[in-house]
Interface confidence: medium
Amino acid sequence: VCSRDFTPPTVKILQSSCDGGGHFPPTIQLLCLVSGYTPGTINITWLEDGQVMDVDLSTASTTQEGELASTQSELTLSQKHWLSDRTYTCQVTYQGHTFEDSTKKCADSNPRGVSAYLSRPSPFDLFIRKSPTITCLVVDLAPSKGTVNLTWSRASGKPVNHSTRKEEKQRNGTLTVTSTLPVGTRDWIEGETYQCRVTHPHLPRALMRSTTKTSGPRAAPEVYAFATPEWPGSRDKRTLACLIQNFMPEDISVQWLHNEVQLPDARHSTTQPRKTKGSGFFVFSRLEVTRAEWEQKDEFICRAVHEAASPSQTVQRAVSVNPGK
Amino acid sequence: VCSRDFTPPTVKILQSSCDGGGHFPPTIQLLCLVSGYTPGTINITWLEDGQVMDVDLSTASTTQEGELASTQSELTLSQKHWLSDRTYTCQVTYQGHTFEDSTKKCADSNPRGVSAYLSRPSPFDLFIRKSPTITCLVVDLAPSKGTVNLTWSRASGKPVNHSTRKEEKQRNGTLTVTSTLPVGTRDWIEGETYQCRVTHPHLPRALMRSTTKTSGPRAAPEVYAFATPEWPGSRDKRTLACLIQNFMPEDISVQWLHNEVQLPDARHSTTQPRKTKGSGFFVFSRLEVTRAEWEQKDEFICRAVHEAASPSQTVQRAVSVNPGK
């Protein structure tokens, strides 16, 4: 604590600015303004990353305004040193006390590669399970103390449901954050727009993403299913293929069923929708089945869930490994 | 030109600095130092993106040192305004002349997301055309005066062939640069490593990418071809599907042939290789054919070119629209 008989200095660093194009000048001046102190001996030291700098400081002479004094000290740095993300400290010793201010190059305000995506509900969740959800996904965040906030809203201004959040550290060291929001089936079908707002201390500004039901023409999918013939060396395994095509819009869910039971999604591999030569989309789905399965019941069903399919938004096709038997 | 009887001012903007962690303060002060002029009336105006600002400037009173005067004017901005990349100008009118300095937030010194990719030769170019090429692709570059340099080298130190370069402006305003290098078939098969080095003034450092023949186990592809049955409303069109699976490594070329002629790649759509449940990969390829084609000759061939296929690195399967006829 400072004793009563002197006014301590305020220490503030100013810096030379970038030009009107945002370019750094070849040299950067740091100006340490030490102001408003009772006249007396002061000592100014500059530190670079906490280490005392051996520099010719070009300290300006002290000026006095009324009963208080001000001093300024200028440090000139090469652009290289400034862009090296070093921290510079102006340290002032006065009346046995230390006062300081530190600065470094401002962090990039548009951090590399942070991206946000907002999905639409899957047709399966929307039409079969009747519990649609949408997911806001934020990828490539650098882990830091600051929290990523994902907030939901509706264009209609109506309240949103409670969302669930998940954070995952990726192998490349980045953070992936997802927030999943349940939406009303009717709200979605009637065209409500949902917004996800992403804020984070390191983001220059909030990222806004919105989603709503796809507009435009509708077309139901055509579904075709095929079984591969036996291949030498794999008698106990076959591959089933399903081609689903000419549907619009591109939102589709694909499932495989055996014995009236839906197989887990992990069992099959389905491609992302791609455009056909016409105006629709297509996907392929691939399922590996075992002899035990086809001997138990040799009928497998490929089912597409799509808003334009009727009745009940589904189209399916059965396929057998040995159709003639 | 200034007349001889006065010394014009120097105008320089200083700004408040970021803290020792590189974080922007909640408000940013711009300090316009107008110095070294013969005492006289001066007028200071601040502009934002060229528009006069309606602000309370808190201009400090003029000080005089010897025969010359100095004035300073301070502008306080919200962090939002500063981070939105606007240009601020301190404009000084003196003796009928205008003097100014401009500034804006310094450009990010580590620009976001430039990526480089280096492809392997397609099996078709390698084994059928016998003129393999590799392509170095640089995406998400901000267009600027600086040139992107892509330089090729070989791990063996042997010379490289002449490469061809292409630049393309994307719709999102970024630049895509590709460089294609012909490589020797034998060099590639024998395991030569090729390097692409990408340099650009805005890149924090050179990007190095290297490519060589994939190592690991080999497995030839299984090829299956299917035709879709007639679908209501599309009597004159059919879709052919080709499933190519269980191959290793993942490099594969897929072609369709009709009447012993290879159809243009644009005619078919082939998925990217995906992993099977086992250790291999699979792709699907889709081809739309017309009645005119199948009535001319009802045999279509799906051909896979892959290094593990024998003989001559190809496996093919024929399919007909009306197999029974």
């Epitope: 906490g50 862009l83 090296s84 993300d85 103390k145 060291g173 | 962690g21 340099t199 003034p201 450092r205």
Partner: antibody
Framework: EVQLVESGGGLVQPGGSLRLSCAVS?????????WEWIRQAPGKGLEWVAS???????NYNPSVKGRITISRDDSKNTFYLQMNSLRAEDTAVYYC??????????????WGQGTLVTVSS | DIQLTQSPSSLSASVGDRVTITCRAS??????????MNWYQQKPGKAPKLLIE???YLRSGVPSRFSGSGSGTDFTLTISSLQPEDFATYYC?????????FGQGTKVEIK
């Protein structure tokens, strides 16, 4: 002033494991910079081993990749080098350092005093 | 990897002598006009100390008798007038490309 202090060195048998620590004082490892391990075999030159960036990304010298893992504990302001399957040629003084960077190029500005690791049966 | 070769590997000199150490890189360490070459000093039982950055920039606090020069593949560290405290081993280091590598060192001994 920033200071780095290594610990955890000692005698270990070939095939064994060891975890070195580098305690940082005077600066938060989450604030910036890249944090490094560099080693020096007895009477030999210096070899960069591994680094961890303030954003958690890691880099390894290909000569040690797979046997060595760099990690950090922000709450302790400490970073670590986990060494497995140790060999006689891993015998060295291990230094931790703080790197300053310029456009992604790092140089080793502040060093610890070093800790000796001896791999011998 | 970029290999660095220093010469000589050792030298004997007297106080007041001018000493020159060279470092040759197996490929250029220049990038956009900057040379990514650094020089370190190491005394027995101590950690290395950074003397010079970017080929020729003297680190803050390093005496001005030390200087660095060169570009591309050839670099030089010069001590204009050797002082007793300068007897040590000097290493060059490139930070142009991963993995960063050091020269094998040059030991400066008292004649």
């Amino acid at each position: 002033e920033v200071q780095l202090v290594e610990s955890g060195g000692g005698l270990v048998q070939p095939g064994g494991s060891l975890r070195l620590s580098c305690a940082v004082s005077g600066y938060s490892i989450t604030s910036g910079h890249r944090w490094e391990w560099i080693r020096q075999a007895p009477g030999k030159g210096l070899e960069w081993v591994a680094s961890i960036h303030y954003d958690h990304s890691t880099n390894y010298n290909p000569s040690v990749k797979g046997r060595i893992t760099i990690s950090r504990d922000d709450s302790k302001n400490t970073f670590y080098l986990q060494m497995n399957s140790l060999r006689a040629e891993d015998t060295a003084v291990y230094y931790c350092a703080r790197a300053t960077h310029y456009f992604g190029h790092h140089h080793f500005a502040v060093w610890g005093q070093g800790t000796l690791v001896t791999v011998s049966s | 990897d970029i290999q660095l070769t220093q010469s000589p590997s050792s030298l004997s000199a007297s106080v007041g002598d001018r000493v020159t150490i060279t470092c040759r890189a197996s490929q250029s360490v220049d990038y956009h006009g900057d040379s990514y070459m650094n020089w370190y000093q190491q005394k027995p039982g101590k950690a290395p100390k950074l003397l010079i950055e970017w080929g020729s920039y003297l680190r803050s606090g390093v005496p001005s008798r030390f200087s660095g020069s060169g570009s591309g593949t050839d670099f030089t560290l010069t001590i204009s007038s050797l002082q007793p405290e300068d007897f040590a081993t000097y290493y060059c280091q490139q930070n142009a490309e991963d993995p960063y590598t050091f020269g094998q060192g040059t030991k400066v001994e008292i004649k």
